[in-house]
Interface confidence: medium
């Protein structure tokens, strides 16, 4: 099974060493799902040549998926720790369905796959434990989910490589400015 | 325009102070992270010191830790460097650089100054 | 303190494409940026979070990372592209960045 951050022996904290803080905790959770994206973009860029596409071609496909934006608060200037946190949890819970769609399309990467997908869903029960404002998350309908999954999978090949590519791309972008944004807080 | 002028730098003895200043205009200071970052005669970049948008912050590589202080104004749109005891492999040209939007502590620079010339020799 | 490694020189003919890696295990987990950097001035940013391209900067130069490798492709290099390019990272901690030593660009021709 999947190792999440914690697990691994080389995790626990060695006598007389601090413990780590929530904060601490959390931002090592996102750099460990980071790793496995990492891995999964190897696996995809040597298979496929989407990764050598200009961005600008790549921005130029029907995917809704989650962004930062500036009335995020999420960003140096303008910053707001209760929107950015609440974007940061809905970004992540509307991401899951991106991730469920990645658990078919890896050969050799498919444990760090499911990794990336329980890994999420631990980080999001973190930041959910911190959020004050949970009455400003909203959680997307299964139903929606369940046909977006559907309609991903009935692509062509091409169209699935590109699929793919997009959502780690963008997974990576949203967790980094995560990441970022959960450090001032 | 986004500008970033340096100034402050010279010759100085070993274990000598010097403090570096940098002028910013054309964006709102007081909403972006700030780094200095040095370069050695011959060599490459190497990241020195950096401090966030209130000046609350501050990270130090451990080259200068001890003896460099990063600061700033945002009152005078002024980033500042002091250096003390000053060693000869401090010798280098000292950048000034803003930092993108995405860089909160894992920083990008989109503007960098001209640089001020720092030589520390007897 | 991550280490970032770049080849130190690579020359290309006009017109042809250059690619410049970097790696180090930092960039798992943080965004490769890139700089290009010409005798006697400051360093300017020409591809930032891995493949994102500054307005100003031309459309030959591009971005991408996986696996902890960076690359930058200057496809169908200019005279202008000459100089030295930085790759640069973030510490494990997020705390410091880290620059490769620098790959100098030679265009031939």
């Known amino acids: 099974a999947p190792v999440l951050p914690g697990e691994d022996s080389k995790d626990v904290a060695a006598p007389h060493s601090q413990p780590l803080t929530s904060s601490e905790r959390i931002d090592k959770h996102i750099r460990y799902i980071l790793d496995g994206i990492s891995a999964l973009r190897k696996e995809t860029c040597n298979r496929s040549n989407m990764c050598e596409s200009s961005k600008e071609a790549l921005a130029e496909n029907n995917l809704n998926l989650p962004k930062m934006a500036e009335k995020d608060g999420c960003f140096q200037s303008g910053f707001n720790e209760d929107t950015c946190l609440v974007k940061i949890i809905t970004g992540l819970l509307e991401f899951e369905v991106y991730l469920e769609y990645l658990q078919n399309r890896f050969e050799s990467s498919e444990e760090q796959a499911r990794a990336v997908q329980m890994s999420t869903k631990v980080l999001i029960q973190f930041l959910q434990k911190k959020a004050k404002n949970l009455d400003a998350i909203t959680t997307p309908e299964p139903t929606t989910n369940a046909s977006l999954l559907t309609k991903l999978q009935a692509q062509n090949q091409w169209l699935q490589d590109m699929t793919t590519h997009l959502i780690l791309r963008s997974f990576k972008e949203f967790l980094q400015s995560s990441l970022r944004a959960l450090r001032q807080m | 325009e986004v500008q970033l002028v340096e100034s402050g730098g010279g010759l100085v003895q070993p274990g000598g102070s010097l403090r570096l200043s940098c002028a910013a205009s054309g964006f709102t200071f007081s909403s972006y992270a700030m780094s200095w970052v040095r370069q050695a005669p011959g060599k490459g970049l190497e990241w020195v010191s950096a401090i966030n948008s209130g000046g609350g912050s501050t990270s130090y590589a451990d080259s200068v830790k001890g003896r460099f202080t990063i600061s700033r104004d945002n009152a005078k749109n002024t980033l500042y460097l002091q250096m003390n005891s000053l060693k000869p492999e401090d010798t280098a040209v000292y950048y000034c650089?803003?930092?993108?939007?995405?860089?909160?502590?894992?920083?990008?620079?989109?503007?960098w100054g001209q640089g001020t010339q720092v030589t520390v020799s007897s | 303190q991550s280490v970032v490694t770049q080849p130190s020189a690579l020359s290309v003919t006009l017109g042809q494409t250059a690619k410049i890696t970097c790696q180090g295990g930092?960039?798992?987990?943080?965004?490769a940026h890139w700089y290009q950097q010409k005798p006697g001035q400051a360093p300017v940013l020409v591809i930032y979070?891995?493949?994102s391209r500054p307005s100003g900067i031309p459309e030959r130069f591009s971005g991408s990372s996986s696996g902890g490798r960076a690359t930058l492709t200057i496809s169908g290099a200019q005279a202008e592209d000459e100089g030295d390019y930085y790759c640069q990272s973030a510490d494990s901690s997020g705390n410091a960045a880290v620059f490769g030593g620098g790959t100098h660009l030679t265009v031939l021709g």
């Open positions: 930092g960039l798992r987990s943080s965004y």
């Open positions: 650089a803003k930092e993108g939007d995405t860089g909160w502590k894992d920083p990008m620079y989109d503007y």
């Open positions: 979070d891995d493949d």
